[in-house]
C-alpha cells in the first residue's frame, strides 16, 4: 500500500525532517506550512491548526518561503545619484544602482549603498582603465605623440596630427598645429592610443618594460569627431 500523504500540521517520524516548504515548529512540535514569498506568518501553527499566512503590507516584502512574523522593510528610496533598477514589491526589495557617470564606492548585498562620480581625467591625461559599476576611472598621462585636451571620464589620449610643417609641436594636452591648411595624415587613420606605457621623449622617459608587462597601447577604433576646446567637458 502506498504511504499516506500527511497534511500539515503533522508530527514527523523520529529522525526525519519536514518536507519542502514546511518548517518544524518547536512549540507545537509539528511540521507546519511555510508562507509563500510576499506573505508572512500571521498566526503560528498549533498541534491542530496550520500556519495562517497574510500578505505583506506596503513597502515590505518577503523574498523566500518563510515563517517570519513580520515582512522585511524595503530599503529607503534611491538617492539622486542612483536609479531604481528593481522596485519594491511584496516579493522583492528595492534595488538601487548608480546612475550613468557614477560608480558604486560602497556596495551592499544587493545594489549600492554609496555612489561616487566617476573621475574625470584632466588635459594631459587620458582614461587608462574605464570606470565600471564598481570601480572608478584610472587616469594616466598621455604618452609621447598623443594628447588629451578635454576633461572627461571617457576620453583616451589621441595621436597628434602629423604635419608637413609644424607650426606648434603637440604636447600631452594639445594637438600639434600645422602651418599648412591640412595635416599630411593622422597617425594610422583610426588608431586610438591608451595613455601608457610611455616611451622616450624629451621629458618623458620609461625603462623598456618586459614583454609580459607591456600591454599594447594601440587599438584600432573608429575615430570620433574632433574633441571640444581645451578645458571643456568631454562627456
Amino acid at each position: 500500500l502506498p504511504a499516506q500523504v500527511a497534511f500539515t500540521p503533522y508530527a514527523p517520524e523520529p529522525g526525519s525532517t519536514c518536507r519542502l516548504r514546511e518548517y518544524y515548529d518547536q512549540t507545537a512540535q509539528m511540521c507546519c506550512s511555510k508562507c509563500s514569498p510576499g506573505q508572512h506568518a500571521k498566526v503560528f501553527c498549533t498541534k491542530t491548526s496550520d500556519t495562517v499566512c497574510d500578505s505583506c503590507e506596503d513597502s515590505t516584502y518577503t523574498q523566500l518561503w518563510n515563517w517570519v512574523p513580520e515582512c522585511l522593510s524595503c530599503g529607503s528610496r534611491c538617492s539622486s545619484d542612483q536609479v531604481e533598477t528593481q522596485a519594491c514589491t511584496r516579493e522583492q526589495n528595492r534595488i538601487c544602482t548608480c546612475r550613468p557617470g557614477w560608480y558604486c564606492a560602497l556596495s551592499k548585498q544587493e545594489g549600492c549603498r554609496l555612489c561616487a562620480p566617476l573621475r574625470k581625467c584632466r588635459p594631459g591625461f587620458g582614461v587608462a582603465r574605464p570606470g565600471t559599476e564598481t570601480s572608478d576611472v584610472v587616469c594616466k598621462p598621455c604618452a609621447p605623440g598623443t594628447f588629451s585636451n578635454t576633461t572627461s571620464s571617457t576620453d583616451i589620449c589621441r595621436p597628434h596630427q602629423i604635419c608637413n610643417v609644424v607650426a606648434i609641436p603637440g604636447n600631452a594636452s594639445m594637438d600639434a598645429v600645422c602651418t599648412s591648411t591640412s595635416p599630411t595624415r593622422s597617425m594610422a587613420p583610426g588608431a586610438v592610443h591608451l595613455p601608457q606605457p610611455v616611451s622616450t621623449r624629451s621629458q618623458h622617459t620609461q625603462p623598456t618594460p618586459e614583454p609580459s608587462t607591456a600591454p599594447s597601447t594601440s587599438f584600432l577604433l573608429p575615430m570620433g569627431p574632433s574633441p571640444p576646446a581645451e578645458g571643456s567637458t568631454g562627456d
Epitope: C139, K140, A143, N171, P197, T205, Q206, P207, G231
Partner: antibody, heavy 119, light 107 residues
C-alpha cells in the same frame, strides 16, 4: 586612509648622491602617478617631476633632468628620488605627492625629507 | 613655462577678518588651479582644486574662485589656526608651477 610615509633626513657631501623614499599605503599604488616637489629653505614650491609606478615612466622639469632620477617599486609600494652630484643648491625639503589625474595634481603629500648638503 | 604670481607676499590679519589672496597665471590655465595650505613645519595640504572646489574636510570659510588667468582664495572669517603659507599651483600643463606663496600671520 591614504598615507605617504617618507624616509628620514639626509646629510650628503658635495658631489655625492642621496636616495630618499616615499612609502604609499591606503590606496592602489599603481593607479596613481607620484610627483616630487622641492622646497628650498624659506622658499616656494618647485615641481621636479613624476613617476608612474605601473610602467616606470617618468617626466621631469627641464631644470631637474640631470639632477633627479625617479623610480618606483611596486612590490613595496614605494617611490624613490635619487639626487646626484649634490651641491649646496640641493639643500631643501623634498616632498612626494600623489596624483589621480583629475583636477588636482597633488591631493596627498608626504611629510617631507630634509636633505642637507654640507662638507 | 607658465608663471604663477601670488600676492601679497605676506599679510597680517585679526581673527574674524576677511582675507583675499590672489594668484595670476601668465597664460590661460582654464580652471586647473589648486590652493594649498602649509602650516609651519608641515607638508602642504590641498584646500581647493579646480579653482573653486573645496577639498574633503576643508572648512567652508575657504572659498576659491576664478578662471583663465586670475584666481582668488578667500577666507571669510580668519581663525587663529589659519596661520600658514598659502600656495597656488597650476596643473594644466608641464612643467607644473607654483606661486611664490603668501604668508598669513594672525595679529
Amino acid at each position: 586612509e591614504v598615507q605617504l610615509q617618507q624616509s628620514g633626513p639626509e646629510v650628503g657631501r658635495p658631489g655625492s648622491s642621496v636616495k630618499i623614499s616615499c612609502k604609499a599605503s591606503g590606496y592602489t599604488f599603481t593607479d596613481y602617478i607620484m610627483h616630487w616637489v622641492k622646497q628650498s629653505p624659506g622658499q616656494g614650491l618647485e615641481w621636479i617631476g613624476w613617476v608612474d609606478p605601473e610602467y616606470g615612466s617618468t617626466d621631469y622639469a627641464e631644470k631637474f633632468k640631470k639632477k633627479a632620477t625617479l623610480t618606483a617599486d611596486t612590490s613595496s609600494n614605494t617611490a624613490y628620488i635619487q639626487l646626484s652630484s649634490l651641491t649646496s643648491e640641493d639643500t631643501a625639503t623634498y616632498f612626494c605627492a600623489r596624483d589621480d589625474g583629475s583636477y588636482s595634481p597633488f591631493d596627498y603629500w608626504g611629510q617631507g625629507v630634509m636633505v642637507t648638503v654640507s662638507s | 613655462n607658465i608663471v604663477m604670481t601670488q600676492s601679497p607676499k605676506s599679510m597680517s590679519m585679526s581673527v574674524g577678518e576677511r582675507v583675499t589672496l590672489t594668484c595670476k597665471a601668465s597664460e590661460n590655465v582654464v580652471t586647473y588651479v589648486s590652493w594649498y595650505q602649509q602650516k609651519p613645519e608641515q607638508s602642504p595640504k590641498l584646500l581647493i582644486y579646480g579653482a573653486s572646489n573645496r577639498y574633503t574636510g576643508v572648512p567652508d570659510r575657504f572659498t576659491g574662485s576664478g578662471s583663465a588667468t586670475d584666481f582668488t582664495l578667500t577666507i571669510s572669517s580668519v581663525q587663529a589656526e589659519d596661520l600658514a603659507d598659502y600656495h597656488c599651483g597650476q596643473g594644466y600643463s608641464y612643467p607644473y608651477t607654483f606661486g611664490g606663496g603668501t604668508k598669513l600671520e594672525i595679529k
